[in-house]
Structure formats: structure tokens, C-alpha cells
């Protein structure tokens, strides 16, 4: 069979139909990301509480954060919102301080449970606050005597960074 | 209507501490953001910090160790204090709301002017 | 620190006169700029953000434009009100910095 002619336009350009389907670059503010596409995708302009973190290209689109004081919410970065302090969640209410027994070491998201070391078998080490989680020791057995000496282990988890923690400071 | 009051002492000593109090009305701090900004006479304006509706706070590096930005959500009330004064920071202090839609100043109070002479 | 230079400095228009101002940043900002008024004696006022948007209230004859380094407030038509000092501001990044002014006079 006849090959689709548009098939030979590869990423940046479009198959324009009113000029005998020939291979025209995306005009300004547009992309095409895959060969063969019969029209470009206009760019994402990251305006407002958006900033620009990838420009646009002929071949691919803008990709936003957020200005700062604010981070990224859904995917692509779809919505900003304002940035809480560690140690709390944002609410319909405003930021609202963790409960006790849950923790917060990011300026987004939820406030989430300390670990429960005994769950382990072991014992806590260095109590949790709102900012950061429980540290859990060694359990009771590698204390007995003869054990050999144990390194507490590091933290769960390391604390987070926002969009605007990593730029713009 | 959305309104801010910066209430200041006027005139400070060098080497003392300015506060400065900024009382809101017609929105919460709970929901929005409070900048600061200066002004000496007959010149530009100089970011100073931001308090975020959480209360997390953002300083600029040339004066950071010098300020402290605080809020009394209770009372509508942002707090702005800057050490170690000297004549150079004689100046018209603002706070200014930041709205939910950029990191930028919407609504101004009309400035306090604070002169640092011994 | 993104330094934020603004020309003129100063410039004297008419009534009904068409005014720019510019705006240059010293590195990208994309479309992160506002612009504000400051009338005599007068604390400031936003005009504009987002480099284009006007704010809610403010009279069709302020327009913004620009983006990466470059940005223009214009007025098309000049009114004795608009005697004031004109700011440009970036929020790309901390720290906040504001351009130095352009002061409106009115003939």
C-alpha cells in the first residue's frame, strides 16, 4: 500500500495539509513531541503562581513549578499551593500543627504516623516531634550482654525538599 | 474590605532594635501571605521577608541575620523586627498582602516612616 | 540577586500621550513580573502581574508585556491621575527585587 506521506515528519514540524503535506516547522509557542503529528500542540505557559522550569521547545513542551512560597500539587505540576511549615499539613482551614504521634518534615503534604519501632522489635531511640519521625534503636536482644555494638540506624526517610526549597534560595 | 496598618515608634537609636506591628483586616493570615518592603526618602523599594499563611518565613540574605518576622494569627497581626539600626535603615517600612495567585503584593498599608538618629 | 534595571529613570508625557516603560532583567525571570504605581506621598499599588494581567480594578489603559529578560508597561493614553512613580518587580526567585523607577511626570 501507499505510505502515509505524514509519517516522514518527524518530531518539530506537522504535516500541513493545505501546503501538498509537506513538513512545516511548529510555528512559535507550539510543539510537536512524535513524528508524524498532523498539527502542533501549543505550549504550556507557566504564569501567575507558575514559574518557568523548562522552556518550550519545537519538540517539547513547557514544564512549570512554582514561584516561591508555594509548591507543586498533581501531576505535572497542575496546581501550586502555599507551602506550610515542617511540623504541619495544610488544611480547608489554613496550615494546622501536626497531631501527636504524626510528623511533617517537608513545607507540603500530610502529616504521617512515627514509625512504631516496637512493630520492630525495638526501642525508640530519639523520640519524634512534629517536624521528625521517631528514630528507632537497636532491639532489646542486640543489648543484651556479648552483643556486638550496633549503629543506631539513620532516619526512615530524609527530609523532602519542595520545588522552591531546591530553586530560587 | 481588605486593609493593613503598620503601626511604628517613629524615631529609634542606633544599635537598638525597630518592631513594627501590622494589623489586617478583611482576609485571615491563616489563608495569606504578609510581605515587608522599605523605602528610605526619595529612593526605591527593597524587599525585606515574607511570612506565608503557615507561617514559614523567607528573609532577604542582605539583611538576614538582622530580621525577624513573626504573626499572632488571633489577633490579625504580623510583627517585623529588625536589630543593630543604623541611619541606613531610616526609612518608610510597608506591609503588603500576598495574594493566591503569584508571589506579588495586592494590597499595601500606607507605611510607617521610621527615623534612626540618636 | 536578579537585578531588575528600569528605563527612563524619568520622563515627562502630555495628556492622551501613548508611555513606556521597560524593564530588564539581569537573568530569565519568564513571565514572573509585576508592575506597581506609587502616587506622591502614597504607598504603592499593583497594576499588573504575571508580566500581562492586569489586577483587578485597574483602568484598561495599562498594559504589561515581556518575557525572559525583557518587559514593557504601557499606557496608551495618559491621564493627569497617572502622575506617579512607576516600579517593575520580579518573584522568579528570592530574593524579591524591584526595579529602581521611572517617575511620570505630566506636562
Known amino acids: 500500500g501507499l505510505q502515509d506521506p505524514c509519517s516522514n515528519c518527524p518530531a518539530g514540524t506537522f504535516c500541513d495539509n493545505n501546503r501538498n503535506q509537506i513538513c512545516s516547522p511548529c510555528p512559535p509557542n507550539s510543539f510537536s513531541s512524535a513524528g508524524g503529528q498532523r498539527t502542533c500542540d501549543i505550549c504550556r505557559q507557566c504564569k501567575g503562581v507558575f514559574r518557568t522550569r523548562k522552556e518550550c521547545s519545537s519538540t517539547s513542551n513547557a514544564e512549570c513549578d512554582c514561584t516561591p512560597g508555594f509548591h507543586c500539587l498533581g501531576a505535572g505540576c497542575s496546581m501550586c499551593e502555599q507551602d506550610c511549615k515542617q511540623g504541619q499539613e495544610l488544611t480547608k482551614k489554613g496550615c494546622k500543627d501536626c497531631c501527636f504521634g504524626t510528623f511533617n518534615d517537608q513545607k507540603r503534604g500530610i502529616c504521617r504516623p512515627w514509625t512504631n519501632c516496637s512493630l520492630d522489635g525495638k526501642s525508640v531511640l530519639v523520640n519524634g516531634t512534629k517536624e521528625r519521625d521517631v528514630v528507632c534503636g537497636p532491639s532489646p536482644a542486640d543489648l543484651s550482654p556479648g552483643a556486638s555494638s550496633v549503629t543506631p540506624p539513620a532516619p526512615a526517610r530524609e527530609p523532602g525538599h519542595s520545588p522552591q526549597d531546591i530553586e530560587g534560595r | 474590605q481588605v486593609q493593613l496598618q503598620e503601626s511604628g515608634p517613629g524615631l529609634v537609636k542606633p544599635s537598638e532594635t525597630l518592631s513594627i506591628t501590622c494589623t489586617v483586616s478583611g482576609f485571615s493570615l491563616i489563608s495569606y501571605g504578609v510581605h515587608w518592603v522599605r523605602q528610605p526618602p526619595g529612593k526605591g523599594l527593597e524587599w525585606l521577608g515574607v511570612?506565608?499563611?503557615?507561617?514559614?518565613?523567607d528573609y532577604n540574605p542582605s539583611l538576614k541575620s538582622r530580621v525577624t518576622i513573626s504573626k499572632d494569627t488571633s489577633k490579625n497581626q504580623v510583627s517585623f523586627k529588625l536589630s543593630s539600626l543604623t541611619a541606613a535603615d531610616t526609612a518608610i517600612y510597608y506591609c503588603?498582602?500576598?495574594?493566591?495567585?503569584?508571589?506579588?503584593?495586592?494590597?499595601w498599608g500606607q507605611g510607617t516612616l521610621v527615623t534612626v538618629s540618636s | 540577586d536578579i537585578q531588575m534595571t528600569q528605563s527612563p529613570s524619568s520622563l515627562s508625557a502630555s495628556v492622551g500621550d501613548r508611555v513606556t516603560v521597560t524593564c530588564r532583567a539581569s537573568?530569565?525571570?519568564?513571565?514572573?513580573v509585576a508592575w506597581y504605581q506609587q502616587k506622591p506621598g502614597k504607598a504603592p499599588k499593583a497594576l499588573i502581574y504575571?508580566?500581562?494581567y492586569r489586577d483587578s480594578g485597574v483602568p484598561s489603559r495599562f498594559s504589561g508585556s515581556g518575557s525572559g529578560t525583557d518587559f514593557t508597561l504601557t499606557i496608551s493614553s495618559v491621564q493627569p491621575e497617572d502622575l506617579a512613580t512607576y516600579y517593575c518587580?520580579?518573584?522568579?526567585?528570592?530574593?524579591?527585587?524591584f526595579g529602581g523607577g521611572t517617575k511620570l511626570e505630566i506636562k
Open positions: 511570612i506565608w499563611s503557615g507561617g514559614s518565613t
Open positions: 503588603a498582602r500576598n495574594p493566591l495567585t503569584a508571589t506579588v503584593m495586592d494590597y
Open positions: 504575571s508580566a500581562s
Open positions: 537573568q530569565n525571570v519568564g513571565t514572573n
Open positions: 518587580q520580579q518573584y522568579n526567585s528570592y530574593p524579591l527585587t
